[in-house]
Interface confidence: low
Amino acid sequence: TQNKALPENIKYGIVLDAGSSHTSLYIYKWPAEKENDTGVVHQVEECRVKGPGISKYVQKVNEIGIYLTDCMERAREVIPRSQHQETPVYLGATAGMRLLRMESEELADRVLDVVERSLSNYPFDFQGARIITGQEEGAYGWITINYLLGKFSQKTRWFSIVPYETNNQETFGALDLGGASTQITFVPQNQTTESPDNALQFRLYGKDYNVYTHSFLCYGKDQALWQKLAKDIQVASNEILRDPCFHPGYKKVVNVSDLYKTPCTKRFEMTLPFQQFEIQGIGNYQQCHQSVLELFNTSYCPYSQCAFNGIFLPPLQGDFGAFSAFYFVMNFLNLTSEKVSQEKVTEMMKKFCSQPWEEIKTSYAGVKEKYLSEYCFSGTYILSLLLQGYHFTADSWEHIHFIGKIQGSDAGWTLGYMLNLTNMIPAEQPLSTPLSHSTYV
């Protein structure tokens, strides 16, 4: 009789990224017998949960169950029923929940408690919901992109060569931008660190990595905008805020109570003689850039070199993958090409920001106005953060690769998180014959 190929034994995993602005559910799959190889896990689905981030449900926790339903039901459809019980589900909450916890540990716990109870109702193997640290977020993002780029193994990867291939095993640095925080993680040239808080040691696939990481809370694009508004309204003589970071002709009313809701604006808080103010866009990149730079305190540095706000940053080394909002914003602005120089990006930003709001609305009719209105700020903020915050230069700009997906998997912390929690990244290089997961337990 002819040999029939046995059905492949596939495993699945689910990670929910509970970010500050929204929650996304990722489904990963991999061949069971290859689970300790590098590069075999890949994403099969992303489901974006309708609504804001979970931290916004603090006053309406009873709605969290319904909020998560659609995407959890989608996971039920995608993953074969026979696999449900052995499919792990993890939820990691990031900076939005870190901020809520700073305001009230009790409220943050209440949200997580309801999230856990909701997710426990599904037929999967729920492993818990927790607020991950900024350091973890940076580290797992770094693991994700280097895992997907095949940097952890000398072996030929199962997928085709990716566009960012540099034909060496030097790892990529990771630049992650969220709504409430931003992370920078890379292997510096000098292995000794002046700041132990920013140092991580990994042994992955038989190799040691000394990694620098830092997460800047309140410097995600949304919280940075709140910070900028709070800073600028201090010097506005009344309830009109002329804002160079919004398109000419753009108008929006902001409640002062909303402005001071976040812990990120506490340092700028003052008693204002009005309850609301109106943003009036004037669309000037240069002035917007100047305003953004005021968010970075570069006058104090207790180390040989700092990023900003007195945080140690070693000299940049190697290539960097910039993902999440770094990618979403630059992709919208059509500025992700490797061929676009930093000077060109700046020139394009100047043009974009100066376009009248009415024109912008017409040109991008399908884009929600809330998001559309903020691309000028976000693009300017990204440039300021990378150049003045992290000290990239016009020359080193070409080492930044704006990455959305690598071989169909989103760049971000979720894959690295799951790989770690499922013990799928061995400390030692596996034998050439793929062995089962239990070998490494």
Epitope: I240, R242, G249, K251, G281, I282, Q286, Q287, S291
Partner: antibody
Framework: EVQLVQSGAEVKKPGATVKISCKVS????????MHWVQQAPGKGLEWMGR????????KYAEKFKNRVTITADTSTNTVYMELSSLRSEDTAVYYC????????????WGQGVMVTVSS | DIVLTQSPALAVSPGQRATITCRTQ??????????MNWYQQKPGQPPKLLIY???SLASGVPARFSGSGSGTDFTLTINPVEADDTANYYC????????FGGGTKVEIK
Amino acid sequence: EVQLVQSGAEVKKPGATVKISCKVSGDSITAYFMHWVQQAPGKGLEWMGRIDPDHERTKYAEKFKNRVTITADTSTNTVYMELSSLRSEDTAVYYCATERVPGFETDYWGQGVMVTVSS
Amino acid sequence: DIVLTQSPALAVSPGQRATITCRTQQTVDHYGTTYMNWYQQKPGQPPKLLIYLASSLASGVPARFSGSGSGTDFTLTINPVEADDTANYYCQQSRNLWTFGGGTKVEIK
């Protein structure tokens, strides 16, 4: 080309209310802030207030705050200014004006409406 | 409100330079943009914009008109003055809603 055409001259008694219109042609009023400016005979220009027709939000000068109401009708592309409790010192020419980008060129002005308050 | 103070009157001969000043009670600058505009008004006509953002010439306005200044002190210069320039000139701030100066009456001798 954008044009602002204002309603005709008015004669009112003290204590009465006047409502002046400003019809815009050539562009939608939602693209602008619409301002009203008062000019008494032989006197200077005095800003009264403005409306953002897009969101129906108004701002008024302190001097006129309790007596002026600015409204907009986007269906007819017309802006209105109503001044109540008229007194003789309200005798003036009233102009409507557009402001597309706050603080940049004030694009267009109406021809003005003479309002006379006399018993 | 931001109060604007202008020199009240000026008499100039044709071909000469006319300088009109305007002082604001507080700055009308914001992030490098100066929200000062200048208007010309002739009897029976609405005001006509001459200069915006302190020094930008409005379209269709002769280059004889120029604006300068920042912060709280501003100048409108007409050089050379022509007979047709007899009018009232108003400064206006638009940093914070609108306020006009009291006006400067320019007479050509």
